[in-house]
Interface confidence: low
């Protein structure tokens, strides 16, 4: 069993002959007469375990000790402390020539925990051991202990274990401690990255490069190595581990950021305050959530602030121009906190008689310079029928717009452009053809650009080639034409007219008169 | 008025895997995150984590990892907790509670409903 | 993880006295506290919130103090139904743990 002492944390012990309680038990030879274990009382008034020798009368001593088997645990290179008193031999009458100041440290490695004999011709030595300060009998009355103290090391070792042996040749020795330790790198944190308890080299000028593994909550920026040295030193630091995102350096540590923080990369930044209109609730927050109503951009940092879509332009009017309008606005009260605002014109045809039923006024509509993302406050929209409701809308928006469930960012106005000549009528029928007369019937023009006041029908004999052509006008989309010649080709023309003036005649439409007296209904656009 | 209906009591043996409902009414929904709650037998009570009901990711507090799933339907307002391969010491009353996934205004958190809890009982 | 340590475990008391009952957490939480009655087999209710506020429909007698690690939830003069069973939880970094509890009996 063995009792605890304290030692350097760069020191790990494989043996301490003073935390053994009860007999050490080690082997000497001869079996008596030499090296025997005797109890003293330490400094502390403790009881210890020691192996004293002290046959300085008779010469050629060679008296052997050995420990128990020590496994090395890795160690390549060990130390052996040895902390002992040596009678000076000049305080001894009588011994001169006998007595000895110094004994031998040797060692023997083996994979055997159960040797139980030494053979001296296995043991290779370490160092020959002379006492640096010697003690008399009277210090021994006083209780005080000279003791000396001396530090060896051994090595490369190879085997599971080994053997230490202490030989005296004639000396007056008590071996009060004995410690066997390797050295180590212990367990250390520097730029985040931890690197393990490591055994040192072989020798002692060797550097064991170690590479370290990042702290909890870190990753890698440049590859951590230390240099372990032979002293059980951390040597010459390389690289470092930077925190995680959503944590911070603190104490050595990546500790997560507080509620109300955040960190968005791995950096060595501490975490930032949650910047305006927003927040975060629990700790290691990367990114802090928008407030109620506010919204994040896809390319705004996380570090922006909270933005909101802006609120309507102000001050829209209008300006018609025939089948034209410019449109001119103001910026936003509330931008919404960004630099990004931007304005898109929505354009919608309605029905006179109820302006609710709207629909999208169609591509065949311009816009100078454009319909979106207008830089300015200002837009000239073209191609616009004529006599036609229109609603314009001119939205607000900016880089968070589309996050908005519920948009109410926009202005709009409702004019009526000016009437303008209707287009030319698409389609003239001959409904009825007798010897004397044509009815005809015709459609309403495509666009009829204001209100139709009257049809305006021309007519003449083919072969006259419009030489010599009749009129007639009626406010209906139909008309009799009377009084023509039997067996005859006419040609017919129809426009349409508002207050803006006549439109286009319509294609002519081509009707021979009939010479028996019947009827001949027709609805083509030739009637023969 | 604001209310959460939890389902009914269970009896179950060892190894079997048991469903518990969290049906909420009266709010909308997604405003707020479900949090759940586990009471052993003349026990305190032991918050077990939530689950945010606009994505639908779970948090499990450390005790929760593995058998124990939180899932949603948000068709039907309903929060769901599953418990696998039962054990003895999963015998315990089961509240679910809301709290605001947004602040308001105020900075602090707190259950303001509980649903009625649900016993589930495990036992051979 | 912060630890919530409630006293007294019980206590038993007359109506019209005066309760007080104390929460302890293991380190600074920022007035992140509410504290609820439960009844038995009933779910926990609300009483209080950010350590001093009080919630909606809870009479005017209890009340809440305190601030870093330790608070206070007093019953000025208690009521038959206020023989229950009262947590306090703290909101300050997950787990959100409660209290063990305090029973408070009809002496």
């Known amino acids: 069993v063995t009792g605890s002492r304290v030692y350097p944390a760069n020191e790990v012990t494989l043996l301490d002959s003073r935390s053994v309680q009860g007999e050490l038990g080690w082997i000497a030879s001869p079996l008596e007469g030499g090296w025997e274990e005797v109890s003293i009382m330490d400094e502390k008034n403790t009881p210890i375990r020691t192996y004293q020798v002290c046959n300085v009368m008779e010469p050629s001593q060679n008296n052997w000790l050995r420990t128990d088997w020590i496994t090395r645990e890795g160690a390549q290179r060990v130390y052996i402390e040895i902390k002992f008193t040596l009678r000076d031999c000049n305080s001894l009458p009588g011994v001169m020539g006998t007595c000895k100041e110094t004994f031998n440290l040797y060692y023997y490695e083996s994979d055997n925990d159960k040797e139980r004999f030494i053979r001296e011709n296995q043991f290779v030595k370490i160092d020959t051991i002379a006492a640096d300060e010697s003690f008399t009998q009277v210090d021994i009355g006083d209780r005080i202990m000279k003791l000396n103290t001396e530090i060896r090391d051994v090595g490369p070792l190879s085997k599971k274990g080994f053997y230490l042996a202490f030989q005296d040749v004639g000396a007056c020795i008590a071996l009060v401690s004995v410690r066997v330790f390797y050295k180590k790198c212990p367990l250390t944190v520097r730029n985040l990255a931890q690197f393990p308890d490591t055994i040192t080299g072989a020798d002692t000028s060797s550097l064991v490069e170690v590479r370290g593994s990042c702290v909890n909550n870190s990753e890698e920026k440049d590859v951590p190595k230390m240099y372990c040295g032979a002293d059980g030193e951390w040597l010459v630091p390389i690289g470092n581990c930077l925190c995680n995102a959503g944590h911070e350096e603190r104490s050595g540590e990546c500790q997560a950021c507080k509620i109300g923080y955040y960190k968005a990369l791995s950096t060595d930044a501490t975490c930032a305050k949650c910047p305006p209109h927003s927040y975060s609730v629990w700790e290691g927050a990367t990114s802090c959530t928008c407030d109620r109503g506010f919204f994040r951009a896809d390319n705004d940092a996380a570090s922006m602030p909270c933005t909101r879509p802006p609120s309507a332009p102000l001050n829209l009017i209008s300006n018609v121009n025939e089948t034209s309008v410019n449109l001119e606005w103001s910026s936003p009260q509330n931008t919404g906190g960004r630099q990004d605002i931007s304005y898109n014109v929505v354009c919608k045809k309605c029905g006179a008689g109820d302006p609710s039923k709207c629909r999208p006024c169609g591509s065949g509509v311009h816009y100078t310079p454009q319909q979106n993302g207008l830089k300015t406050t200002k837009v000239s929209i073209t191609d616009l029928l004529a006599h036609t409701n229109y609603t314009f809308e001119i939205w607000a928006v900016n880089g968070v717009s589309k996050y908005n469930p519920n948009p109410d960012q926009s202005v709009s106005v409702t004019v009526t452009t000016n009437q303008a000549a209707p287009s030319s009528i698409a389609l003239v029928q001959a409904k009825e053809v007798t010897r004397y007369s044509v009815a005809l019937a015709w459609l309403e023009p495509d666009r009829p650009n204001g209100v139709i006041l009257e049809y305006e029908v021309k007519y003449y004999e083919k072969d006259q080639n419009e030489r010599s052509y009749r009129i007639v006008r009626t406010a209906a989309r139909n008309t009799d034409i009377k009084g023509l010649n039997p067996l005859t080709s006419y040609v017919f023309h129809v426009r349409a007219r508002t207050a803006a003036g006549y439109g286009d005649f319509s294609e002519p439409l081509e009707v021979t008169t009939n010479t028996v007296p019947s009827r001949i209904i027709g609805d083509g656009a030739n009637s023969t | 008025q604001v209310q959460l209906v939890q389902s009914g009591s269970e009896l179950k043996k060892p190894g079997a895997s048991v469903k518990v409902s969290c049906k909420a009414s009266g709010y909308t929904f997604t405003d707020y995150s479900m949090h759940w709650v586990r009471q052993a037998p003349g026990q305190g009570l032991k918050w077990m984590g939530w689950?945010?009901?606009?994505?639908?990711?779970?948090t499990y507090a450390q005790g929760f990892t593995g058998r124990f799933v939180f899932s949603l339907d948000t068709s039907v307002s309903t929060a769901y907790l599953q418990i696998s391969s039962l054990k003895a010491e999963d015998t315990a009353v089961y509240y679910c509670a809301r709290i605001p996934l947004y602040y308001y205004g105020s900075r602090y958190w707190y259950f303001d409903v509980w649903g009625q809890g649900t016993t589930v009982t495990v036992s051979s | 993880d912060i630890q919530m340590t409630q006293s007294p475990s019980s206590l038993s008391a007359s109506v019209g006295d005066r309760v007080t009952i104390t929460c302890r957490a293991s380190?600074?939480?920022?007035?992140?506290l509410a504290w609820y009655q439960q009844k038995p087999g009933k779910a926990p209710q609300l009483l209080l919130y950010a350590a001093t506020n009080l919630a909606d429909g809870v009479p005017s007698r209890f009340s809440g103090s305190g601030s870093g690690t330790d608070y206070t939830l007093t019953i000025s003069s208690l009521q038959p139904e206020d023989f229950a069973t009262y947590y306090c939880?703290?909101?300050?970094?997950?787990?959100?743990?409660f209290g063990q509890g305090t029973k408070v009996e009809i002496k």
């Open positions: 380190e600074n939480i920022y007035r992140n």
């Open positions: 689950i945010n009901t606009e994505t639908g990711e779970p």
């Open positions: 939880q703290h909101f300050w970094g997950t787990p959100w743990t």
